[in-house]
């Protein structure tokens, strides 16, 4: 902390320019008014302060404001952003999407710093649910910011939030949060036409349960590998070989390539290996010809 | 709580064929959701999947021992099966049979050792 | 085959430590990852599934993260009772593969 001494005469600070940058951190402190840095703040971000002169001048917006800065200064912090740790971003209270956005450009670039996700937090709590700009915005300056979220967190997002996510940022997203997503999905392009909605629906079909893939190859989506790939195993283990085919299309011939890994290979041992020869694929591991398969999805539904 | 219980001989000759057998109580082989695994850990050493059966007869085995492997199921007795041919002083381990949930790991057997040799 | 890779493959600690095990994929394997514990002479427990799903009856200080070819095991606050060998699997390809091993020993 910088002990209080008196401004030398001349010296008082009467606006915030370029001056300042001459001036001891004992200067800063003595001759630079609190209110008068508050009112200029915008000013702050043009001036190369050091990082010991931007120090002083956080401690005295610090003392100006010990409950938390007024949304007033925080939309013109710029740099001095970086200078906040979560502590004191908990004390404010964020509400604009113009102040969000101005301290996510200061840390563009850069991962998400305990600072940024402290600043989200606040700024979602206090709207109640993650909207669509919001959302937007996010995931403009991070692209994995959803897959950061936790299934609870996701349960907040509405459907029609959901128009502002794009297939990379589901990317990084596991299939529990898919769980959350795909259902907000579903009801938010239900009205769009068959292929429109699958070009939408793909990114969150992780997420599906068995009976929408039983639909959807009804729909000749043809499906690629990938998509296929990211399926719930669960979701994939009822489809029969002909609903896989259906799905999946001319993309059939890639089962070959991954019929050692999930979901694939747990598909396989459930099918009948002269249903698999009807691809001619030369998959492998079906279950063998002439073996009795009782249904036991009942018994263990009851067990 | 299902349990899994392996059994078999201790000591195997070079040359001969390994067998072993896993009996399951408070569960059944005949479940849809699990697959049977045999995995094994030479001592002192790391583990390694030998192979699996699933209730319908449809096998997986790792490609390294595949040409001497055999894995079966009798869903009668529920139990399942290891048959490793050809074996040498390499296969001194400890066999641990497991039940494996396609999406939930692995739950093991105690283990039995079995020795190679003459 | 899928090389599970662990580090470190063995680290001393005290009770009360926080310990951090990792373990890499050759490739990716989705979340397809679990967690086991192995003590002398005992048959391996599983610990965390699905990378980062906590076992039935597994004490909560145990905590899986990670997607894709990084995972990590976090033990918050070490326990005598978990002084053991730790090993990652992968389920997501045949054939199936375990890490070499973690020894956490003790300091």
């Known amino acids: 902390e910088v002990e209080k001494t008196a401004c030398p005469s001349g010296k008082k600070a009467r606006e915030i320019d370029e001056s300042l940058i001459f001036y001891k951190k004992w200067e800063l402190e003595a001759c630079v008014d609190a209110a008068l840095l508050a009112t200029q703040m915008d000013r702050v971000n043009a001036i190369p302060f050091t990082y010991e002169q931007l120090d002083v001048l956080k401690h005295k917006l610090d003392e100006l404001y010990p409950q938390g800065y007024p949304e007033s200064v925080i939309q013109h912090l710029g740099y001095l952003f970086l200078k906040m740790s979560p502590e004191d971003i908990r004390k404010w209270n964020v509400t604009s999407l113009e102040t969000l956005k101005a301290l996510l450009e200061v840390n563009k670039g850069h991962e998400m710093s305990p600072q940024v996700a402290t600043l989200i937090d606040r700024f979602v709590k206090g709207r109640g649910q993650l909207d669509k700009d919001t959302l937007d915005t996010l995931t403009a300056f991070y692209p994995g910011y959803l897959c950061s979220l936790s299934p609870e967190e996701l349960s907040s997002v509405p459907p029609s939030s959901i128009w502002a996510v794009r297939p990379q940022d589901l990317d990084t997203c596991d299939p529990r949060q898919l769980d959350v997503l795909y259902p907000k999905a579903r009801l938010a392009f239900q009205n769009m036409n068959g292929s429109e909605y699958f070009v939408k629906i793909q990114s969150f079909l992780g997420g599906a349960p068995t009976e929408d893939l039983k639909a959807l190859s009804q729909q000749n989506v043809s499906m690629d590998l990938a998509t296929f790939m990211k399926l719930r195993t669960d979701a994939v283990l009822p489809l029969t070989v002909a609903e896989v085919q259906k799905l999946l299309g001319p993309h059939v011939e890639g089962l070959k390539a991954e019929e050692r890994h999930r979901p694939v290979r747990d598909w396989i041992l459930r099918q009948r290996q002269d249903d698999l020869d009807t691809l001619g694929l030369g998959l492998q591991g079906g279950i063998p010809n002439g073996y009795l398969v009782l249904d036991l999805s009942m018994q263990e539904a009851l067990s | 709580q299902v349990q899994l219980q392996e059994s078999g001989p201790g000591l195997v000759k070079p040359s001969e064929t390994l067998s072993l057998t896993c009996t399951v109580s408070?569960?059944?082989?005949?479940?849809?959701?699990?697959?049977w695994s045999w995995i094994r850990q030479p001592p002192g050493k790391g583990l390694e999947w030998i192979g699996y059966?699933?209730?319908?007869?449809?096998?997986n085995y790792n490609p390294s021992l595949k040409s001497r492997v055999t894995i079966s199921v009798d869903t009668s007795k529920n139990q399942f099966s290891l048959k490793l041919s050809s074996v040498t002083a390499a296969d001194t381990a400890v066999y641990y049979c497991a039940r494996d949930h396609y999406e939930r790991g692995l739950y093991w057997g105690q283990g039995t050792l079995v020795t190679v040799s003459s | 085959d899928i090389q599970m890779t662990q580090s470190p493959s063995s680290l001393s600690a005290s009770v009360g430590d926080r310990v951090t095990i990792t373990c890499r994929a050759s490739q990716s394997i989705s979340s397809y990852l679990n967690w086991y514990q192995q003590k002398p002479g005992k048959a391996p427990k599983l610990l965390i599934y699905?990378?980062?799903s906590l076992q039935s009856g597994v004490p909560s200080r145990f905590s899986g993260s990670g997607s894709g070819t990084d995972f990590t095991l976090t033990i918050s606050s070490l326990q005598p009772e978990d002084f053991a060998t730790y090993y990652c699997?992968?389920?997501?390809?045949?054939?199936?593969?375990f890490g070499g091993g973690t020894k956490v020993e003790i300091k």
């Open positions: 699997q992968q389920s997501y390809s045949t054939p199936l593969t």
């Open positions: 059966i699933y209730y319908s007869g449809s096998t």
């Open positions: 699905a990378a980062s």
């Open positions: 408070g569960g059944s082989v005949s479940s849809g959701s699990y697959y």
